[in-house]
């Protein structure tokens, strides 16, 4: 409630997060022309990436382009990229949609299609749909610990969301445990009215709002956070220009003294932690 006699001050905040959980991933692996089921374990180091600011990212799906080498090759025959003669290919041209620099030659991509030869990481990335269901759909059961320290410098008051009395094995629940700072990712989505399994395919952005409404007067002192959740990206994926949330990264290695890389297009959820509120004191 608004106490007009109080001097109000906006919150200054710092956030630190820790994600925990293990995912078992089953996917088709092709070796020597033979496709078989491959099983792999993903731990925190495999699916989380350090982000700047009050954000963390959890990979929920991916598309791999394995064994890429820097050389010449035909570019992927995306729409409008096919050619029938060298005239269509311009030496030195860097098409923003392409993955390399054209050599000026039109070469066979496969039995039926020709594309411009490019200097690039080869074979160039194919335009594949994100796997459905998501490969790391079990990320729904991962948990995140959010440490939030806040400060009101004008009132010389500092506190944090984690209290010494808190149980490390608790899980946030809006009704039963609203002060627990360990959140199950699936619960965050449920609270926001979203389907984790669906969002995990293409990725998305989820907001975790921490609201501090602090009464710092000694006779009626109260300063505890209130958590709420809402989706921040455009969820109408059919209508949005670039649906979901994804980025690419590479793992580099050497094979027979040749530098190679595995390109990974990672889809996942970026969680943005938004801390706001005021501290009031007479």
């Amino acid at each position: 409630s608004d106490k007009l006699y109080q001097r109000k001050e906006p919150v200054i905040s710092s956030v630190h997060t820790k994600v925990k959980g293990i995912a078992e991933v089953t996917e088709n692996v092709t070796e020597g022309g033979v496709t078989k089921l491959g099983h792999s374990i993903f731990d925190t180091a495999d699916y989380t990436f350090p982000l700047q600011g009050n954000s963390f990212f959890v990979m929920t799906n991916y598309v791999k382009s394995e064994g890429q080498v820097q050389t010449l090759c035909p570019e992927y025959p995306r729409r409008g990229a096919q050619c029938s003669s060298d005239r269509r290919c311009k030496k030195g041209w860097m098409d923003p949609q392409s993955k390399g620099i054209q050599t000026g030659r039109c070469v066979p991509y496969d039995k039926t299609r020709k594309t411009c030869e490019v200097s690039a990481w080869c074979p160039t990335e194919e335009e594949k749909e994100a796997p459905r269901p998501a490969l790391l759909r079990s990320a729904e059961n991962f948990t995140v610990l959010i440490k939030n320290n806040i400060h009101f410098p004008g009132h010389n008051y500092t506190t944090r969301n984690i209290l010494p009395t808190m149980n490390g094995s608790c899980t946030f629940h809006k009704t039963w445990d609203p002060q627990c700072s360990i959140f199950r990712l699936g619960d965050i989505f449920q609270e926001a009215g979203e389907n984790f399994t669906e969002v995990a395919v293409q990725g998305g952005i989820m907001g975790i709002e921490i609201y501090w409404d602090c009464n710092l007067d000694s006779w009626s002192h109260h300063c505890r956070p209130r958590y709420s959740f809402r989706r921040l990206d455009d969820k109408n994926t059919d209508e949005s220009f670039v649906p979901g949330y994804n980025f690419r990264y590479a793992k580099y290695y050497k094979e027979n003294n040749v530098e190679k890389r595995t390109l990974i297009k990672a889809f996942g959820i970026r969680f943005d932690i938004l801390v706001f509120g005021t501290g009031g004191k007479f």
Partner: nanobody
């Protein structure tokens, strides 16, 4: 139909030479690789050629002894093998792929192979 046919194999004494041919039909290729497989061993990439610029790659064990060339008009590539050693004995085949250049066999052409035997 996409096809590759090898020829030129045979029996030769150590230090001798052979010239293998790989003729393509039914498609225009971009990269051709020569591979060999000795009994009880894995398939090994010997060399590759890129048709557009004629650049070649050779595995270390054949460098300086084998030469790959192409005849675009004839749709044929050649593997000139000199100073042959008994360890070069294998079935040699060509394919529209090159592992060294990360070029997968999207065209799907692969020959049946030709036997090369080097006696000591």
């Amino acid at each position: 139909e996409v096809q590759l046919v090898e020829s030129g194999g045979g029996l030769v004494q150590s230090g001798g030479s052979l010239r293998l041919s790989c003729a393509g039909s039914g498609f225009s290729y971009y990269i051709i690789g020569w591979f060999r497989q000795a009994p009880g061993k894995e398939r090994e990439e010997v060399s590759c050629i890129r048709v557009t610029d004629g650049s070649t790659y050779y595995t270390n064990s054949v460098k300086g002894r084998f030469t790959m060339s192409r005849d675009n008009a004839e749709n044929t590539v050649y593997l000139q093998m000199n100073s042959l050693k008994p360890e070069d004995t294998a079935v040699y085949s060509c394919a529209t792929e090159c592992q060294r250049w990360a070029y997968p066999n999207r065209i799907g052409a692969r020959g049946q192979g030709t036997q090369v035997t080097v006696s000591s």
